[in-house]
């Protein structure tokens, strides 16, 4: 048993038919030493009396609020969670496997530049009775700061019969250095509660690893004169860490045809323009990656020809 | 070139040979997620190896204030790779065909490496732990491991050499 | 887009010679090496070498060694791979492929095959 | 040379079955190991590299896992266009050896 926040403890229990479960000792906060009894949660059965109780931890029944009382006086609480351990893994019930980039993929992660800042989320089919706390930190062992916000819910999709609800947060490194490379990881943790239940994630990984820039910006088409020929311009996101000639990108042009069967003419470069012939009905798409590390490209930047 | 004493590099040149070596590492090893590397006990090797850091002078600002200090720590890095890269780490099995981007990766280590310093001025360089896994999978491992941490260090030092080109040459 | 394009079908005299031919276009030919395999009637694939055509320098499964010799052509960026002393066992269908860019041989691309029948 | 022992030689099963092909190798190859699917009268297609990696375009139901000397491919819902046959590769140690193959059937 461990302590998840004041008055919240965590037992840790190998799940399996006629496990024995956990023995737990509960100390009521108080300095009264007589006339002290025990509740669980909202009944009013007298579990046992004594500034301790002990109990026998097997499943979801035996966790939830331990109060004691004296004289119809509230004295202190102490709540409960499991944390089912099955052929000696830890559950992962409350969370959805997103399966990219591999399986067990809980946790996903994406930064828009080098300064530190990135957001991670995940996804639950889960609506009430559902709390998340995120913690993160440089390395492990020797943790430098990382300060995540509060996880809220970003997104809500349907899926099948299903409703599916995606959760994010934002964290940024205390003292980023985005020029250094980097030698330790990010470690983010998530702590997941539903109703007694108790699980946590983890990730971790580098920055480098994680980085999408968001879409090139002020995408243009210039005709060139007696040609069927445009010049497409470009700038970087805003985003984007500077300078540029330091954070350099490079980007890919696409010409698509209305359908997706039609061949797409691709052209890389690492100037902000190309020139491409423009097929009637066809659009022109930008995307960008960083130009001496291969992490995600972009989404796509569109324009259509005509 | 860039020497001990502190005249400038080449830097176009540079910045041409940095961006063929990262193009180079992420042909050796193109997959991100096939293996989590960190979860499979963590070799000397990539512990030792140089890092850019952040007091190195390799950002925009200590750069223009002293180049020096990042390329001799470049320096450091590229010879430490290079001789990781014709240890017999890479040899052995699993057998490398010999189009591997190893070989033109080895090679063009040593060129930037040259570029930098040449024959007759000397900087400090870093041991290489002696290393050499007897199992196929230990090698493959420790290849993987070193190609994924030269692909963070060639991606920093092409930043700084692209950086020199456009801001810093004469 | 990569593409290997072998010579048709070949029916062959026990004891005589069999010259296979593999073009290779949507890549630059020296860069990458090209391997033959082969995969008798109803049987598993057997490796049987490959050419560096950078060097010409070819490497064969021992197995084959003094019945097979590979080689390439630079100026039409074309492989061959060349049987001799035919035998009926020689029978079978014969692959030419380049793998993967990194420098390990898990084959991406392969030719359509050509069947080598030995028959008297 | 490396051995590469493929099971079953042959298998059926149906439409939305787990499948299974497990290959042994005679020695450590690390995990230098790819399957390949070849349909009949077709070429071969690789579907998994480094003994776990999908090649671009391999459908999500097709998996690989193993290291060392054990590996398996699995196929976690059967449809019927994967009746073919099955090699796993080992590409660690010349000459490069392929398992004898397995004919995967519908039942």
């Known amino acids: 048993i461990w302590e998840l926040k004041k008055d919240v403890y965590v037992v840790e229990l190998d799940w399996y038919p006629d496990a024995p479960g956990e023995m737990v000792v509960l100390t009521c906060d108080t300095p009264e030493e007589d006339g002290i009894t025990w509740t669980l949660d909202q009944s009013s059965e007298v579990l046992g009396s004594g500034k301790t109780l002990t109990i026998q931890v097997k499943e979801f029944g035996d966790a939830g609020q331990y109060t004691c009382h004296k004289g119809g006086e509230v004295l202190s609480h102490s709540l409960l969670l499991l944390h089912k351990k099955e052929d000696g893994i830890w559950s992962t019930d409350i969370l959805k496997d997103q399966k990219e980039p591999k399986n067990k993929t809980f946790l996903r992660c994406e930064a828009k530049n080098y300064s530190g800042r990135f957001t991670c989320w995940w996804l639950t089919t889960i609506s009430t009775d559902l709390t998340f706390s995120v913690k993160s930190s440089r390395g492990s062992s020797d943790p430098q700061g990382v300060t995540c916000g509060a996880a809220t819910l970003s997104a809500e999709r349907v899926r099948g019969d299903n409703k599916e609800y995606e959760y994010s947060v934002e964290c940024q490194e205390d003292s980023a250095c985005p020029a250094a490379e980097e030698s330790l990881p990010i470690e983010v943790m998530v702590d997941a509660v539903h109703k007694l239940k108790y699980e946590n994630y983890t990730s971790s990984f580098f920055i480098r690893d994680i980085i999408k820039p968001d879409p090139p910006k002020n995408l243009q088409l210039k005709p060139l004169k007696n040609s069927r020929q445009v010049e497409v311009s470009w700038e970087y996101p805003d985003t984007w860490s500077t300078p540029h000639s330091y954070f350099s990108l490079t980007f890919c042009v696409q010409v698509q045809g209305k359908s997706k069967r039609e061949k797409k003419d691709r052209v890389f470069t690492d100037k902000t323009s190309a020139t491409v012939i423009c097929r009637k009905n066809a659009s022109i798409s930008v995307r960008a990656q960083d130009r001496y590390y291969s992490s995600s490209w972009s989404e796509w930047a569109s324009v259509p020809c005509s | 070139r860039a020497v001990p004493g502190g005249s400038s590099p080449a830097w176009t040149q540079c910045q041409q040979l940095s961006q063929k070596l990262c193009t180079l590492a992420w042909s050796a090893h193109p997959l991100v997620g096939h293996m989590d590397l960190r979860e499979e006990g963590d070799e000397e090797t990539t512990n030792d190896v140089p890092h850019i850091q952040c007091g190195d002078g390799c950002d925009p600002q200590g750069l223009r204030d002293n180049s020096q200090f990042c390329l001799q720590r470049i320096h450091q890095g590229l010879i430490f790779y290079e001789k990781l890269l014709g240890s017999d780490i890479f040899t052995g099995e699993p057998s490398l065909l010999p189009d591997s981007p190893v070989g033109q990766l080895h090679a063009s280590l040593l060129g930037l490496s040259q570029l930098l310093q040449p024959e007759g001025h000397h900087w400090e360089t870093q041991q290489i732990p002696s290393l050499s896994p007897s199992q196929p999978w230990q090698r493959l491992l420790l290849r993987f491991k070193i190609l994924r941490s030269l692909q963070a260090f060639v991606a920093v030092a092409a930043r700084v050499f692209a950086h020199g080109a456009a801001t810093l040459s004469p | 887009q990569v593409q290997l394009v072998q010579s048709g079908a070949e029916v062959k005299k026990p004891g005589s010679s069999v010259k296979v031919s593999c073009k290779a276009s949507?890549?630059?030919?020296?860069?990458?090496?090209i391997h033959w395999m082969r995969q008798a009637p109803g049987q598993g694939l057997e490796w049987i070498g490959y050419i560096y055509p950078r060097d010409d320098s070819p490497k064969y499964n021992e197995n084959f060694k003094g019945k097979v010799t590979i080689t390439a052509d630079k100026s039409t960026s074309t492989a061959y791979m060349e049987l001799s002393s035919l035998r009926s066992e020689d029978t079978a269908v014969y692959y030419c492929?380049?793998?993967?860019?990194?420098?390990?041989?898990?084959?991406?691309?392969w030719g359509q095959g050509t069947l080598v029948t030995v028959s008297s | 040379d490396i051995q590469m022992t493929q099971s079953p030689s042959s298998l059926s099963a149906s439409v939305g079955d787990r499948v299974t092909i497990t290959c042994k190798a005679s020695?450590?190859?690390?995990?230098?190991v790819a399957w390949y699917q070849q349909k009949p009268g077709k070429v071969p297609k690789l579907l998994i590299y480094?003994?776990?990696t999908r090649h671009t375009g391999v459908p999500s139901r097709f998996s690989g896992s193993g290291s060392r000397t054990d590996f398996t491919l699995t196929i976690s819902s059967l449809q019927p266009e994967d009746v073919a046959d099955y090699f796993c590769?080992?590409?660690?140690?010349?000459?490069?050896?392929f398992g004898s193959g397995t004919k995967l059937e519908i039942k």
């Open positions: 020695r450590d190859v690390a995990i230098a």
């Open positions: 492929a380049i793998p993967d860019r990194s420098g390990y041989a898990h084959f991406i691309y």
């Open positions: 480094w003994a776990s």
């Open positions: 949507g890549y630059t030919f020296t860069d990458q090496t």
């Open positions: 590769h080992q590409y660690s140690s010349y000459p490069f050896t």
